[in-house]
């Protein structure tokens, strides 16, 4: 049982480390100014990032990063005819 407990703790610790490294990656995206003016869904308004809003930095920069990835795939499909990159997850909604 002790081994199982250690395994669970190690797994939890690894997840925390993963989240921290992801956070650092997102901070680097913010520093590089990733994202643009292209809008996502309603209620997803992009505001200038400030130190006072540091709690929202990761979420905000991640959503911008996702938008950029989505538009890249779109452009590849519609202007580059790279159909393998088209989103095909029909069952999601």
């Amino acid at each position: 049982r002790r081994d199982v407990a250690h395994g669970i703790l190690n797994e939890a610790y690894r997840k925390v480390l993963d989240q921290l490294s992801a956070g650092k990656h997102l901070q680097s995206l913010v520093a590089r100014g990733v994202g643009g003016s292209l809008g996502g869904g309603a209620g997803d308004d992009a505001e200038p990032l400030s130190k006072r809003h540091s709690d929202g930095i990761f979420t905000d920069s991640y959503s911008r990063y996702r938008k950029q990835m989505a538009v890249k795939k779109y452009l590849a499909a519609v202007l580059g005819k790279r159909y393998k990159q088209r989103v095909k997850n029909k069952g999601r909604r």
Partner: antibody, heavy 112, light 109 residues
Framework: EVQLVESGGGLVQPGGSLRLSCAAS????????MTWVRQAPGKGLEWIGF???????YYASWAKGRFTISRDNSKNTVYLQMNSLRAEDTAVYFC??????WGQGTLVTVSS | DIQLTQSPSTLSASVGDRVTITCQSS???????LAWFQQKPGKAPKFLIY???KLESGVPSRFSGSGSGTEFTLTISSLQPDDFATYYC??????????FGGGTKVEIK
Amino acid sequence: EVQLVESGGGLVQPGGSLRLSCAASGIDLNSYYMTWVRQAPGKGLEWIGFIDAGGDAYYASWAKGRFTISRDNSKNTVYLQMNSLRAEDTAVYFCARDLDLWGQGTLVTVSS
Amino acid sequence: DIQLTQSPSTLSASVGDRVTITCQSSESVYGNYLAWFQQKPGKAPKFLIYEASKLESGVPSRFSGSGSGTEFTLTISSLQPDDFATYYCAGGDISEGVAFGGGTKVEIK
């Protein structure tokens, strides 16, 4: 015959709302990107935004907040909801599968 | 945001002429994802060329595209009666999705 047909256009007062539909026949739209583009009378083409197969929509910055793209896969139809309409929104609105198959367009006139 | 400038805005030509339309971008087009469309009055645009130089299926071989980065051209090697129309370039813009050029009207001389 493979085609897209837009509907829902017409005359609307400034500040009003309108929902345009884009229905497909002869093709399953579900796995395609769907795009809306508009063209003011005598002017060029203007990109509004797109929706992916999963239902996530992305917009040009000028359209965000007033325009909403959605899709109903069971009806093989895509929609463009337009709110707080202005005179400068007067245009023919086109839907397109990717950008290689287009509908004939539907005219929206915003005027009092 | 990318601005696409087409020149000339109007072009007068005769059947059989070689016609060249230029599309200049204010910054590099993402992935060279630049397309050309043909539009006739009262009709929807027709997809001609994608990724700057690749011909869409069913489009006559007299149409060709070239260029990269910020400078692109559409060439019609021998203008046919059916080719009198307005042509638009469209480029990939990560910030704004798709940017269209202002259009070039090809009319009969």
